[in-house]
């Protein structure tokens, strides 16, 4: 695609190339043959993040605490506010417009990856030799107790939800 009639950071209006407004500023009036483009800084709680010809700045995102949100990074005239979720919660979407409680891994499942502000808990089924007997957002699958190392024997086999039960070895009378 060949270059257009106006250069980068310019726009075409009424048969002339006008300068775009820089990030953080909005367009007040287009240039003319005799005047430059007129731009004004965005107000408090507003931003524009690109070279632009917008006549209105965008409002900063509001991190609504009622939705479990808090400010991760305060917005500037050139950047939007970045929201994240309160401890124990995570964003429901990439835009992080609301939060949900981290899920817990049920008994029989352990935490593969602990949740963050932007991702939920990832659970995995406890494989043979491991168990989880609690519903938790932090607990991994635990290995069954090794009866042998305690000089004990297995009295009750373990499952993915229960540990093995060890007992004393039968003594010959």
């Amino acid at each position: 695609e060949p270059p257009t009639a106006c250069r980068e950071k310019q726009y075409l209006i009424n048969s002339q190339c006008c300068s775009l407004c820089q990030p953080g500023q909005k367009l007040v009036s287009d240039c003319t043959e005799f005047t430059e483009t007129e731009c004004l800084p965005c107000g408090e709680s507003e931003f524009l993040d690109t070279w632009n010809r917008e006549t209105h700045c965008h409002q900063h995102k509001y991190c609504d605490p009622n939705l479990g949100l808090r400010v991760q990074q305060k917005g500037t005239s050139e950047t939007d506010t970045i929201c994240t979720c309160e401890e124990g919660w995570h964003c429901t979407s990439e835009a992080c417009e609301s939060c949900v409680l981290h899920r817990s891994c049920s008994p029989g499942f352990g935490v593969k990856q602990i949740a963050t502000g932007v991702s939920d808990t990832i659970c995995e089924p406890c494989p043979v030799g491991f168990f989880s007997n609690v519903s938790s957002a932090f607990e991994k699958c635990h290995p069954w107790t090794s009866c042998e190392t305690k000089d004990l024997v297995v009295q009750q086999a373990g499952t993915n939800k229960t540990d093995v039960v060890c007992g004393p070895q039968d003594r010959l009378r």
Epitope: C6, S15, T32, E33
Partner: antibody
Framework: QVQLVQSGAEVKKPGASVKVSCKAS????????IEWVRQAPGQGLEWIGV????????NYNEKFKGRATLTADKSISTAYMELSRLRSDDTAVYFC?????????WGQGTLVTVSS | EIVMTQSPATLSVSPGERATLSCRAS??????LNWYQQKPGQAVRLLIS???RLHSGIPARFSGSGSGTEYTLTISSLQSEDFAVYFC?????????FGQGTKVEIK
Amino acid sequence: QVQLVQSGAEVKKPGASVKVSCKASGYGFTNYLIEWVRQAPGQGLEWIGVINPGYGGVNYNEKFKGRATLTADKSISTAYMELSRLRSDDTAVYFCARGGSGFAFWGQGTLVTVSS
Amino acid sequence: EIVMTQSPATLSVSPGERATLSCRASQDISNHLNWYQQKPGQAVRLLISSTSRLHSGIPARFSGSGSGTEYTLTISSLQSEDFAVYFCQQGNTLPWTFGQGTKVEIK
């Protein structure tokens, strides 16, 4: 004073190409855009495209994309409009105009007649 | 594309009278509206740019007004040299488009 002087009338056969020139004087050639417009007999004005003579950047009317080619030669302050695959309905007066706020100054026009 | 509609197609006026020409855009063109005069055998002439800015050398009897989609060219007192065809043109959005013209003729 600003002047745009266009090349003379042309008669072309259907399927041929025509190249119209527009020589500018009286201002800095690279400081303003050059617009191209045509007017069919008894009709209104139709925009073809615009070129920035400073570096050759162009915008075309979608209707003429692929058939119109706008160029400029800074060394002789001249802009060109070439139209290919001519049809009888391309018969019109072709104008160049200097940009600014609007089409500030116009050439006298070049009549292109397409006839078999 | 933006469609420009001029009215009336022909305007019959006596010399010395006022002439009012209208131009309507199919969408808001933010005052990027220009007026041109075309006379047979002469180069097209820019009269008014950006709704109301009189081009250099154009007599003050020509004036322009309007906003949004509705624009007007007024010739306060028609002189013999003003009988011509007048075109409006929007410069807000590519492709640039013109009205079909208003012919101002002697009544």
